[in-house]
């Protein structure tokens, strides 16, 4: 009879791994090097155990692999001899969430490692400003998020609770709209959406600037600055200037920081190159006409922030035009 000292037992270790929907992940597992390596990755739910990936007798064995893992898993075969039993997992789905056990047997020991996989998603949210008849609304929207996020609103930096929440997707991922009626307000508003699992936060900030009164054929300068508190220097962002008219938004100019490209959709619109280099995206609109009256919206957006600045421009007839009438 051989001594059982040859067979050491290592208790089950547990690790929590967080992945993102649609992305790849590595479920880690290591063991003390030995010959006769057997590896079984299994998924455990309340009722059953499913074969995710197996390796023994020197090769991957997928005959009993559950179909949901087909072509989505692999081991680092050339590293097994060095004690690496980690599983490479492709194209994560929310259904992949749960408990995975990695059994490793060698000629000298057997160990079981437990990995808890959590899957999150946080597709960049956005803040929208909408006018419906005489009412004005701010909408914080996230198209795909999991788990359910924490959404908070602030008015002039004071937390508020009155918002209308809409959610779709019963099990996840969720699509969420949080709407705030800001009719008649000239306060600044901030909406924060937090995914606690991915430790990712997005903030949308809305500011209404004082109304600008201009005469016909004059020009107007509309301010819009990128606040360094919000944006880190290497962060990609985009700037969109648009005009709100009868509840419809039409784009006037568009800037992409990654390519430094600017597109103008209105020939009378321009911005100061010098200012732009200093992260000031203030706009000039020349040769004003009466029909230019309305709301102008500057949207600076990155993965983490959206800054909305609203300008109301009132263009009045010039004296000559008025006397002509």
């Amino acid at each position: 009879i051989f001594l059982s000292a040859f067979f050491t037992y290592v208790p089950m270790n547990e690790q929590i791994i967080i992945g993102r929907l649609g992305e790849d992940i590595i479920l880690p597992s290591s063991f003390e090097r030995g010959s006769e390596v057997v590896i079984h990755w299994k998924y455990q739910d309340s009722y059953n155990s499913y074969n995710v990936h197996s390796y023994y007798k020197g090769s991957g064995r997928l005959e009993s692999q559950d179909t949901r893992y087909a072509n989505r898993t692999s081991l680092f075969y050339n590293e097994i001899q060095n004690g690496n039993a980690s599983l490479f997992f492709r194209r994560l789905s929310l259904l992949d969430e749960g408990i995975y056990t990695c059994y490793v047997g060698t000629a000298i020991q057997a160990i079981t490692n437990k990995v808890v996989l959590k899957v999150g998603v946080f597709l960049t949210p956005m803040m929208k400003y909408e006018k419906r008849n005489t009412n004005s609304f701010l909408i914080c929207n996230v198209l795909s998020v999991y788990p359910r996020p924490i959404i908070t609103w602030k008015m002039d930096n004071t937390p508020i609770s009155e918002n209308n929440m809409q959610e779709t997707g019963s099990l996840g991922p969720f699509s969420i709209n949080s709407t705030l009626n800001i009719t008649g307000s000239n306060s600044s508003y901030e909406c924060t959406i937090e995914n606690s699992l991915l430790k990712q936060t997005w903030t949308g900030r809305w500011t209404m600037k004082d109304g600008l009164h201009k005469m016909q054929s004059e020009h107007v300068s509309l301010s819009c600055e990128l606040v360094n508190d919000y944006f880190s220097p290497n962060q990609d962002f985009k700037v969109t200037w648009s005009r709100m008219e009868s509840g419809i938004s039409s784009i006037l100019a568009y800037y992409l920081s990654s390519s430094q490209n600017t597109t103008f959709y209105e020939s009378r619109f321009s911005w100061n190159k010098e200012l732009k280099n200093q992260s000031d995206f203030s706009m000039n609109l020349t040769d004003l006409s009466l029909s230019d009256s309305g709301e102008y919206l500057c949207n600076i957006s990155s993965d983490e922030y959206t800054l909305l600045t609203i300008h109301t421009v009132h263009v009045e007839p010039s004296q000559e035009t008025a006397s002509d009438n």
Epitope: Y9, E36, H40, K42, K57, Y103, A110
Partner: antibody, heavy 121, light 107 residues
Framework: QVQLVESGGGVVQPGRSLRLSCAAS????????IHWVRQAPGKGLEWVAV????????YYADSVRGRFTISRDNSKNTLSLQMNSLRVEDTAVYYC??????????????WGQGTLVTVSS | DIQMTQSPSTLSASVGDRVTITCRAS??????LAWYQQKPGKAPKLLIY???SLESGVPSRFSGSGSGTEFTLTISSLQPDDLATYYC?????????FGQGTKLEIK
Amino acid sequence: QVQLVESGGGVVQPGRSLRLSCAASGFTFSDYGIHWVRQAPGKGLEWVAVIWYDGSDKYYADSVRGRFTISRDNSKNTLSLQMNSLRVEDTAVYYCARDRSSGAMGYFVYWGQGTLVTVSS
Amino acid sequence: DIQMTQSPSTLSASVGDRVTITCRASQSISSWLAWYQQKPGKAPKLLIYKASSLESGVPSRFSGSGSGTEFTLTISSLQPDDLATYYCQQYNSYSYTFGQGTKLEIK
């Protein structure tokens, strides 16, 4: 010290059933696959069945498939072999034997002392 | 099933002799072969796995070699304690199969 102790053998008539047990100690039972191997009197060894460490996979020799069922209770460190529709040619000493690891390797590192099953009318 | 054929069926040798037992598989089994020793009235005991790896605690006079279909078990210097029947076993695929055994007698 690794120990495997078989029990449940005896004399049984053809067509009847018998249940063999194997009690394991000296190792973490739930980490290892266990096999049944038999040996007819004066004859060679014949592999019968295997059950993997977690009970998820079971494989049988053609000669017993459909008649024998292997099972395990990891909470009690026991292995069973339910033998139905027994035939005279099933007469043998039945050994339970521990796999190198999960049950996937397929060779036998530790053996019990065996229990004799005699199928006779 | 893969057939395993051992030769010779019986072998008589003297203490100190070098003894070789051969095992042939009906198809390639790579190196997935084990050798066991069974003494009268006892359970088998693992000697060699993966064709040539010596199991822990087994005397170094035992060695194995071969791959594919041809394998050998060698006892470099026969000892009285080696009186037993020796079996090869393939574990390349289910069902696992044994050779018919080689009975080793001491002259």
